[in-house]
Interface confidence: low
C-alpha cells in the first residue's frame, strides 16, 4: 500500500503519500478552530507509470496509452485512497463544541 | 456534474471530462480484442481551484492550502468519478468470448 509505512521510508518519485502539516490559521486562514492548531493532513503526489498502483482498469489503460503517447496529457493522477477523520474543538459563543470532520487525513494513495 | 453534457459543450480549463478515443491496437498494442477496434474511453484533466467540484473535505482543504501557498505541489487532482464497463469480443482459439471489462469508460470527473 502507498501509505506512511512504505512512502515515508522510501525515496519515491512515483505516486506516494507525502507528509504535509497544515496550520489552520496560517495555511487556511481558519480562525474558528480552537484545537488542534494544525494537523498532519498529508497529500498524494508523484508519477503514475504503467501498473503503478492503478485504481481501475481505465487508469491502467490510460497509463499504457501515456507510455505510447508520451506527451499526451491523458495520464492517471496520484490521489488519496484511504482517508480518516479529524476531531476538532471550536466555540459557538462561549459554548465549546467537539466535532469530527470526515475525510481530513490522507492515509494512502492510488493512481486514478 | 463534470460530465459530457457539461464539459463537451464548454471551453473549460478547470477539471472536466475530455474526449479520448483509444484504438486498442495502435494506442495500447492490444491485438487480442476482436471487437470493438477501439472505444471512447475519455479522461479527466484540468485545474482544481478552490471549491471546483471537490470530492472530499481533504481536497477542499488542499485546494485552499494551494491558494494560500501557490508554489506548493500539494494540490488536488482531476480524476475519474463515474465509470462504465465496456463489452468486448475476443477469441480463445476459434471460440468467441464476450466479456464485460469493468471501469473502462469515464463518464464524469472530480477533484480529489
Amino acid at each position: 500500500a502507498l501509505d506512511a509505512a512504505y512512502c515515508f521510508r522510501n525515496v519515491q518519485d512515483n505516486c506516494c503519500l507525502r507528509p504535509l502539516y497544515i496550520d489552520f490559521k496560517r495555511d487556511l486562514g481558519w480562525k474558528w478552530i480552537h484545537e488542534p492548531k494544525g494537523y498532519n493532513a498529508n497529500f498524494c503526489a508523484g508519477a503514475c507509470p504503467y501498473l503503478w498502483s492503478s485504481d481501475t482498469q481505465h487508469s491502467r489503460v490510460l497509463s499504457l496509452y501515456n507510455t505510447i503517447n508520451p506527451e499526451a496529457s491523458a495520464s492517471p493522477c496520484c490521489v488519496s485512497q484511504d482517508l480518516e477523520p479529524l476531531t476538532i474543538l471550536y466555540y459557538i459563543g462561549k459554548t465549546p463544541k467537539i466535532e469530527q470532520l470526515s475525510n481530513m487525513i490522507v492515509k494512502s494513495c492510488k493512481c486514478s | 456534474a463534470l460530465d459530457a453534457a457539461y464539459c463537451f459543450r464548454n471551453v473549460q480549463d478547470n477539471c472536466c471530462l475530455r474526449p479520448l478515443y483509444i484504438d486498442f491496437k495502435r494506442d495500447l498494442g492490444w491485438k487480442w480484442i476482436h471487437e470493438p477496434k477501439g472505444y471512447n474511453a475519455n479522461f479527466c484533466a484540468g485545474a482544481c481551484p478552490y471549491l471546483w467540484s471537490s470530492d472530499t473535505q481533504h481536497s477542499r482543504v488542499l485546494s485552499l492550502y494551494n491558494t494560500i501557498n501557490p508554489e506548493a505541489s500539494a494540490s488536488p487532482c482531476c480524476v475519474s468519478q463515474d465509470l462504465e464497463p465496456l463489452t468486448i469480443l475476443y477469441y480463445i482459439g476459434k471460440t468467441p468470448k464476450i466479456e464485460q471489462l469493468s471501469n473502462m469508460i469515464v463518464k464524469s470527473c472530480k477533484c480529489s
Partner: antibody
Framework: EVQLQESGPGLVKPSETLSLTCTVT????????VNWIRQPAGKGLEWIGY???????YYASWANGRVTISKDTSKNQVSLKLSSVTAADTAVYYC???????????????????WGQGTLVTVSS | EIVLTQSPGTLSLSPGERATLSCQSS????????LSWFQQKPGQAPRLLIY???TLTSGIPDRFSGSGSGTDFTLTISRLEPEDFAVYYC????????????FGGGTKVEIK
C-alpha cells in the same frame, strides 16, 4: 472552420526578441497542442517547439534557453518569443495544430494539421 | 541530435510516372511509426499527406501511399499528376529526446 493565423512584426533588430502570436479559431487550446515551425527562405522546415493542451511546453534543443511558448486559452492565442535573434533567425514562421485521430490527441505522430499561412520575420538592423 | 535524411534531393519525372521518395532517421521514430509526410508548393504552407507512416489524411488522393517502420520510410506517388510537382518533407516524432520532432531536408519533385 478550423484556422490558425500568425501575426507580429515583420522586422526585428539583431539581439532583440522576436514576438509572434498565433490566433486560433474553430477549436479550443484546452483540447489541442499547437506547434511553432519555421522555414528560412529557400530552405527546409525546422520545428521550434510546442505547447500541449495540458499546458506543457517543449522546445527543440537548438532553441532551448532562447525560446518561450505560452498560451492564453481564453483569448485563443499562442505566443512565441525568441530572444537574442540574429540574421540566421530570418524565416517564415508557422503555427500548426496537432491533428486529432479518432478523438485521440495524437501527439508525437508528427501529424501537424492544419497550418497557419505563415508570417515572414526578417532580422536586420 | 536527430537527423532525418531525405533522398534524392531532386527528382525529375514526367506526369504519369511513379515517384519514390525516401526518408531515413538517425534513430527510430517513436512506436516505429510516428512519421508524417508533407507537401509544400511555392508560397504556401505545408499540407499533411500521411501520418503514422502509412495512414492517408482525409481528402488526399489514394495515389499517395506511405510505408516503412523504425528508421526507413518511403512515400510513393503511383502516377504523378501535374499538381503533384512540389517539395515533399518527412517529419518524425521521438520520445526520450529533447527534440520531440524533426523534419527532413525535403525532396523536390520537378517536371522533367
Amino acid at each position: 472552420e478550423v484556422q490558425l493565423q500568425e501575426s507580429g512584426p515583420g522586422l526585428v533588430k539583431p539581439s532583440e526578441t522576436l514576438s509572434l502570436t498565433c490566433t486560433v479559431t474553430g477549436f479550443s487550446l484546452s483540447s489541442y497542442t499547437v506547434n511553432w515551425i519555421r522555414q528560412p527562405a529557400g530552405k527546409g522546415l525546422e520545428w521550434i517547439g510546442y505547447i500541449s493542451y495540458g499546458g506543457s511546453a517543449y522546445y527543440a534543443s537548438w532553441a532551448n534557453g532562447r525560446v518561450t511558448i505560452s498560451k492564453d486559452t481564453s483569448k485563443n492565442q499562442v505566443s512565441l518569443k525568441l530572444s537574442s535573434v540574429t540574421a540566421a533567425d530570418t524565416a517564415v514562421y508557422y503555427c500548426a495544430r496537432h491533428m486529432q485521430v479518432g478523438g485521440a490527441p495524437t501527439g508525437s505522430m508528427a501529424a501537424f494539421d492544419p497550418w497557419g499561412q505563415g508570417t515572414l520575420v526578417t532580422v536586420s538592423s | 541530435e536527430i537527423v532525418l535524411t531525405q533522398s534524392p534531393g531532386t527528382l525529375s519525372l514526367s506526369p504519369g510516372e511513379r515517384a519514390t521518395l525516401s526518408c531515413q532517421s538517425s534513430q527510430s521514430v517513436y512506436n516505429n511509426n510516428y512519421l508524417s509526410w508533407f507537401q509544400q508548393k511555392p508560397g504556401q504552407a505545408p499540407r499533411l499527406l500521411i501520418y503514422g507512416a502509412s495512414t492517408l489524411t482525409s481528402g488526399i488522393p489514394d495515389r499517395f501511399s506511405g510505408s516503412g517502420s523504425g528508421t526507413d520510410f518511403t512515400l510513393t506517388i503511383s502516377r504523378l499528376e501535374p499538381e503533384d510537382f512540389a517539395v515533399y518533407y518527412c517529419a518524425g516524432g521521438y520520445s526520450g529526446s529533447s527534440d520531440k520532432y524533426a523534419f527532413g531536408g525535403g525532396t523536390k519533385v520537378e517536371i522533367k
